[in-house]
């Protein structure tokens, strides 16, 4: 941190390494929950027009796709991977792409992904041909 910028105690708004280098925050699509037409596709765009600066530098991009008898929704947010989201751990937070993984939720089909490149939750990928070992 530059000497003229105060470092406050217990500050999670700034992340530094041992040399004092500062981590810039993630840029993510952030439209909360919106109705979606994304269904039976290998990948979808979020159709979220808001790219937001995540509040804390450790936060990553998250997308949550849900389908029930009534509708389909897509949620796009920033979230701290140290904390569960919808009761699930963000296990793929370091991925550059948002690869959807199905989670068990009663009464609905529930997919979630997280990723850590700018606006990576704009393109959500359901296709089996992508996996965590894929270098792309």
């Amino acid at each position: 941190i530059p000497p003229h910028v105060q470092k406050s105690v217990n500050n999670d708004m700034i992340v530094t390494d041992n040399n004092g280098a500062v981590k810039f925050p993630q840029l993510c699509k952030f439209c909360d929950v919106r109705f979606s037409t994304c269904d039976n596709q290998k990948s979808c765009m979020s159709n979220c027009s808001i790219t937001s600066i995540c509040e804390k530098p450790q936060e990553v991009c998250v997308a949550v796709w849900r389908k029930n008898d009534e509708n389909i929704t897509l949620e796009t947010v920033c979230h701290d991977p140290k904390l569960p989201y919808h009761d699930f751990i963000l296990e793929d937070a370091a991925s550059p792409k948002c690869i959807m993984k199905e989670k068990k939720k009663p009464g609905e089909t529930f997919f979630m992904c997280s990723c850590s490149s700018d606006e990576c939750n704009d393109n959500i990928i359901f296709s089996e041909e992508y996996n965590t070992s894929n270098p792309d």
Partner: nanobody
């Protein structure tokens, strides 16, 4: 020598407006994503807004979305922040900072990545 020099701060009433400027020199301005970052008294840094080097794509924190507008004039090597509908919670020192697009960290603690800041006080 890299320099980032902010100006335009001051005392303004709630609901008022201010325009901040950041004059950049000593580096190739058009290669950097530029940021406005603020620090309220006794608080941590808040990343307010960013703008891409070319194409002028802009990004905002949710706390300022719709009230603040970031812009840049690459011919003048200057970054701007137009702040409207100011609130007491916008009171802070405002810094400009530079980032190589795609790079997640600044280089080191001595970095020439930050200006000295300009104080904005919103109070009646």
């Amino acid at each position: 020598e890299v320099q980032l020099l902010e100006s335009g701060g001051g005392l303004v009433q709630p609901g008022g407006s201010l325009r901040l400027s950041c004059a950049a020199s000593g580096f190739t301005f058009t290669e950097y994503r530029m940021w406005w970052v603020r620090q309220a008294p006794g608080k941590g840094l808040e990343w307010v807004s960013a703008i891409e080097p070319i194409g002028n794509r802009t990004y905002y924190a949710r706390s300022v979305y719709g009230r603040f507008t970031i812009s840049r004039d690459n011919s003048k090597n200057t970054l701007y922040l137009q702040m409207n509908s100011l609130r007491a919670e916008d009171t802070a020192v405002y810094y400009c900072a530079k980032q190589i697009p795609g790079r997640k960290w600044t280089a080191n603690s001595r970095f020439d990545y930050w200006g000295q800041g300009t104080l904005v006080t919103v109070s009646s």
